[in-house]
């Protein structure tokens, strides 16, 4: 066959859909690979062709669009399942072509089963709510385009297995679920079940997302360096191991990059010749505030090393801070005979 621009298997778009529910899948070519949309392609005389490879098979085969009740159909750049079956799992390819042009991309489609409590292998989107931040809403995701605006679906919300009704601070409002005041105890999986009629049949769309309650921007502060501090002096003799922890607290900030680093005499440890190692550990609070500890270690410290400046730096979207560690050489205790001699005025 003639050459075709093959974008390969687009595993970034691992599409998961529930068994026995409608699914509408847009050809990824127009969303991620080509610089024009379906309407432009169609009016230029290009045709969109769909085919698939079943799970654990190598054979590409056409999609059967002549199933009873049009179970699988294509509408513009969308492949429709009304509804899906478990054995629809496989790699689907959409190809755009005419006599002179060809472009195609494949993507995996996985039809997954759920239990009565909506547990499944589905990867769940995470929605972060700010703690105690006033009314916040989550919206039932990915239901656009399934039914016209004239159709009024029924929506039922669940937390885990339980229908949300008479919850103190969580109120279902159609496609939205309102949290009057988000608390840690609101963490969990929330499911909306959208039920709508179509051509005398009733379909259900199930969408589950994970709610994670995180620190509020109202409480956010610049990084706080707890160690090193002014109360601790790192007093060492040459040959001993020098260990200095830098412990920094970062408020949760959406999309902020938290950084901690050491400088020695104003340089990054990688840029100096001394044998220094840095180990980092990270812990999180219940609201995803972060405490990072970087321990600077010099196995056998020299008297030169004990004269250097060791500074811990931290940066987040809220600001940058730095704190120097107090490092000094231990003064050896005077020898007894010398001390006595000095005491008697000897020089």
């Amino acid at each position: 066959s003639e050459r075709c621009d093959d974008w390969g298997l687009d595993t970034m778009r691992q599409i998961q859909v529930f068994e026995d529910e409608p699914a509408r899948i847009k050809c990824p070519l127009f969303e991620h690979f080509l610089k024009f949309n379906y309407s432009t392609a169609h009016s230029a005389g290009l045709t969109l062709i769909w085919y698939w490879t079943r799970q654990d098979r190598d054979l590409e085969e056409p999609i059967n669009f002549r199933l009873p009740e049009n179970r699988i159909s294509k509408e513009k750049d969308v492949l429709w399942f009304r509804p899906t079956l478990l054995n629809d799992t496989g790699n689907y390819t959409c190809m755009l072509r005419n006599t002179t042009y060809c472009s195609k991309v494949a993507f995996p489609l996985e039809v997954v089963q759920k239990d009565s409590c909506f547990n499944s292998p589905m990867k769940l989107p995470v929605h972060k709510l700010y703690i105690e931040y006033g009314i916040q809403r989550i919206t039932c995701p990915n239901v656009d385009g399934y039914f016209p605006s004239s159709v009024k679906p029924t929506i039922t919300w669940y937390m885990g297995c339980y229908k949300i009704q008479n919850f103190n601070n969580v109120i279902p409002e159609g496609m939205n679920l309102s949290f009057l005041i988000a608390l840690i105890s609101n963490n969990g999986n929330y499911t909306c079940v959208v039920t709508y009629p179509e051509n005398g049949r009733t379909f259900h769309l199930t969408r589950t997302l994970t709610v994670k309650v995180v620190g509020s921007p109202k409480n956010a502060v610049p990084p706080v360096i707890h160690s090193p501090n002014d109360h601790v002096v790192y007093e060492k003799e040459p040959g001993e191991e020098l260990l200095i922890p830098c412990t920094v607290y970062f408020s949760f900030l959406m999309d902020s990059r938290n950084e901690v680093w050491w400088t020695i005499d104003g340089k990054k440890p990688d840029d100096i010749t001394i044998d220094v190692t840095i180990n980092e550990s990270i812990s999180h609070s219940r609201t995803e505030d972060e405490t990072r500890t970087q321990i600077l270690s010099i196995k056998k410290v020299t008297s030169e090393d004990l004269k250097r400046s060791y500074v811990c730096h931290a940066r987040s979207a809220k600001g940058e801070v730095a704190k120097a560690a107090k490092v000094k050489q231990k003064v050896p205790a005077p020898r007894y005979t010398v001390e006595l001699a000095c005491g008697f005025g000897a020089t």
Partner: antibody, heavy 119, light 108 residues
Framework: QVQLLQSGAEVKKPGSSVKVSCRAS????????IDWVRQAPGQGLEWMGG????????NSAQNFQDRITITADKSTNTAYMELSSLRSEDTAVYYC????????????WGQGTMVTVSS | EIVLTQSPGTLSLSPGERATLSCRAS???????LAWFQQRPGQAPRLLIY???RRATGIPDRFSGSGSGTDFTLTISRLEPEDFAVYYC?????????FGGGTKVEIK
């Protein structure tokens, strides 16, 4: 008005287990976290762990992790804390406490259950 | 683990006096999730203050909380006879949840 009612005092032998119950009355139970806190005689308060009944999410303090089991029965509005391999230093009053409706602080406490571990 | 250190261990005051109790954390308290509890002998603890400075339902306004980060204070503006008890601070923002060792407020 929500109340937390705990089971009665227990006397246990070292090495055995104890299961303390905490029943909520007069309000919604399953959507709030129920935590367990203990207090040895003349000592301060020590958090042991907690559960959110509706999701079954449970977590506990490291020093109890291998000995504690926290469960909840939504049908009876009751939370349970079972502590195994008891030793004399587990002698304490065990409290259950509810996270609040408008905050995550412990706003309602049970009356406490005295557990004595003695041979 | 966040360690909470309360001071003083004991506070001897007379009714009508002002009490200032301190609670210091080894690390910043997440989301200002710091609470104060009162415990009278033979009773369960009672929530006084949550979120550093918010009074719990039914708590008189002579109790107030303040602070941020690692340093927190509970103030009782005028001690009443029923206020003589043990007071605990607690952080509930990071697991494990931890309590301070307590401050006993006793009658002078």
């Amino acid at each position: 008005q929500v109340q937390l009612l705990q089971s009665g005092a227990e006397v246990k032998k070292p090495g055995s287990s104890v299961k303390v119950s905490c029943r909520a009355s007069g309000g919604t139970f399953s959507i709030y976290a129920i935590d367990w806190v203990r207090q040895a005689p003349g000592q301060g308060l020590e958090w042991m762990g907690g559960i959110i009944p509706i999701s079954g999410t449970e977590n506990s303090a490291q020093n109890f992790q291998d000995r504690i089991t926290i469960t909840a029965d939504k049908s009876t509005n009751t939370a349970y804390m079972e502590l195994s391999s008891l030793r004399s230093e587990d002698t304490a009053v065990y409290y259950c406490a509810r996270n609040g409706a408008t905050s995550d602080a412990f706003d309602i406490w049970g009356q406490g259950t005295m557990v004595t571990v003695s041979s | 683990e966040i360690v909470l250190t309360q001071s003083p261990g004991t506070l001897s005051l007379s009714p009508g006096e002002r009490a200032t109790l301190s609670c210091r954390a080894s690390l910043s308290v997440s989301s200002n999730y710091l609470a104060w509890f009162q415990q009278r002998p033979g009773q369960a603890p009672r929530l006084l203050i949550y979120g550093v400075s918010r009074r719990a339902t039914g708590i008189p306004d002579r109790f107030s909380g303040s602070g941020s980060g690692t340093d927190f204070t509970l103030t009782i503006s005028r001690l009443e006879p029923e206020d003589f008890a043990v007071y605990y601070c607690q952080q509930y923002g990071s697991s494990p949840l931890t309590f301070g060792g307590g401050t006993k407020v006793e009658i002078k």
